[in-house]
């Protein structure tokens, strides 16, 4: 879609962002791409956050310009300077905080025109679960542990053999606050486990969904884990 701006004589350019989630305490990426320009000096990138007075980050004339940067982002943001020329305006965010959640705008000016796109950034904590056989227990028991989650997730057990079965009566889940007083360790125990079966421990909050599988046979134990971020959509 090309829109003419009579006053500036510039057209709109396509800017694309992807909604994403940040894992608190780790680094995050706010993704943004645009129609590239031939000259780096003609490209201006501005990252703004709704409700924040100063800029999140500004890059222009081939370098960072951070005199108007908001204090909450000082020393925590960087663009991939060598990739700006090919249309990458993504922002790296150091040590993601809960307060970094919100609506961001990636605003681009090039010699071809202007454009912007919003990005919803969620923050929380999510980690891969590990399922093990609990040999200390009196009966056959599985223990599912994940070190860091926030907000508090739900934990659901499932099994390949008893598909659709409700394991809430034979499982017990606890949440233990970690030392930084935000994230929590998730521990879920499943009792009365039968051999030659595959069990899944599914942990989910509004940011991520993670599954830890364990296959228990008489001769071996096989484990598998995967994690999926929810609501990653382009705009």
């Amino acid at each position: 879609l090309i829109i003419g701006f009579g006053i500036s004589g510039r057209h709109s350019i396509t800017v694309t962002t992807v909604a994403s989630a940040g894992n608190i305490g780790e680094d995050g990426i706010l993704s943004c791409t645009f129609e590239p320009d031939i000259k780096l000096s003609d490209i201006v990138i501005q990252w703004l956050k709704e409700g924040v007075l100063g800029l999140v980050h500004e890059f222009k004339e081939g370098k960072d310009e951070l005199s108007e940067q908001d204090e909450m982002f000082r020393g925590r943001t960087a663009v991939f300077a060598d990739q700006v020329i090919v249309g990458n305006a993504s922002l790296r965010l150091k040590n993601v905080q809960l307060t970094d959640a919100g609506t961001y705008k990636c605003y681009i000016i090039t010699s071809k025109g202007k454009g912007n796109a919003n990005l919803e950034y969620k923050t929380g904590a999510f980690s891969m679960p590990e399922v093990n056989v609990d040999y200390n227990a009196s009966s056959e028991t599985l223990r599912c542990e994940a070190p860091r989650w926030f907000p508090q997730p739900t934990v659901v057990w499932a099994s390949q053999v008893d598909q659709g079965a409700n394991f809430s009566e034979v499982s017990n889940t606890s949440f233990e606050l970690n030392s930084e007083n935000v994230t929590m360790k998730v521990v879920s125990v499943l009792y009365n486990v039968t051999i030659n079966n595959t069990y899944s421990c599914m942990i989910e909050n509004d940011i991520a969904k993670a599954t830890g599988d364990i296959k228990v046979t008489e001769s071996e134990i096989k484990r598998r884990s995967h994690l999926q971020l929810l609501n990653s959509k382009a705009s």
């Epitope: 305490g25 780790e26 680094d27 100063g54 980050h57 370098k63 960072d64 310009e65 951070l66 005199s67 108007e68 940067q69 908001d70 204090e71 000082r74 020393g75 925590r76 943001t77 960087a78 790296r92 150091k94 040590n95």
Partner: antibody, heavy 119, light 107 residues
Framework: QIQLQESGPGLVQPSQSLSITCTVS????????VQWVRQSPGKGLEWLGV???????DYNAAFISRLSISKDNSKSQVFFKMNSLQADDTAIYYC?????????????WGQGTLVTVSA | NIVMTQSPKSMSMSVGERVTLSCKAS??????VSWYQQKPEQSPKLLIY???NRYTGVPDRFTGSGSATDFTLTISSVQAEDLADYHC?????????FGSGTKLEIK
Amino acid sequence: QIQLQESGPGLVQPSQSLSITCTVSGFSLTSYGVQWVRQSPGKGLEWLGVIWSGGSTDYNAAFISRLSISKDNSKSQVFFKMNSLQADDTAIYYCARDITTIVEGFAHWGQGTLVTVSA
Amino acid sequence: NIVMTQSPKSMSMSVGERVTLSCKASEKVGTYVSWYQQKPEQSPKLLIYGASNRYTGVPDRFTGSGSATDFTLTISSVQAEDLADYHCGQSYSYPFTFGSGTKLEIK
């Protein structure tokens, strides 16, 4: 190329204040923060504070009551002032710049200025 | 404050030997660890940033590795000019802190 150069008094009387100027070239103070680090004789490095592109500062809590950092973007100068110096503040004082706008490593250092606190 | 503990305090190596320096953080610092070389009467020089990225112009015999709390600087084949103090530092959270250094001597 990127350069930082400290200029200081060399000798400071106990209980007096220390002022150091760091003059930079090859980059703009509106793009990068400038860090301050000191090294006492035979000791390790100690981070003192930073002034960011926008002029805001962060200080090591151990020095917050007697340290102030300011700058003049147009002159490419950063000003470091520490009050109430004692003998154990004798050190080489460095200004330094980060490798990127995210603090990942101090890539550029001044030559350092030796400050001796003595009567 | 995050404490960075370096070991050993000092070591003496022959030219051509492999050197491994250790730096342990008292809390997780992600990959926000840098390594510096400081020769007598000189300012520190950045060798490694982001735990494993070699800074421009640094010889490829210097390698950094590690994440979270345990970090290593390896010199694959030490040279006479590597005689220096080596410092690790974290820039994950305030106050930024450094280890007390490892003195590398050449036999």
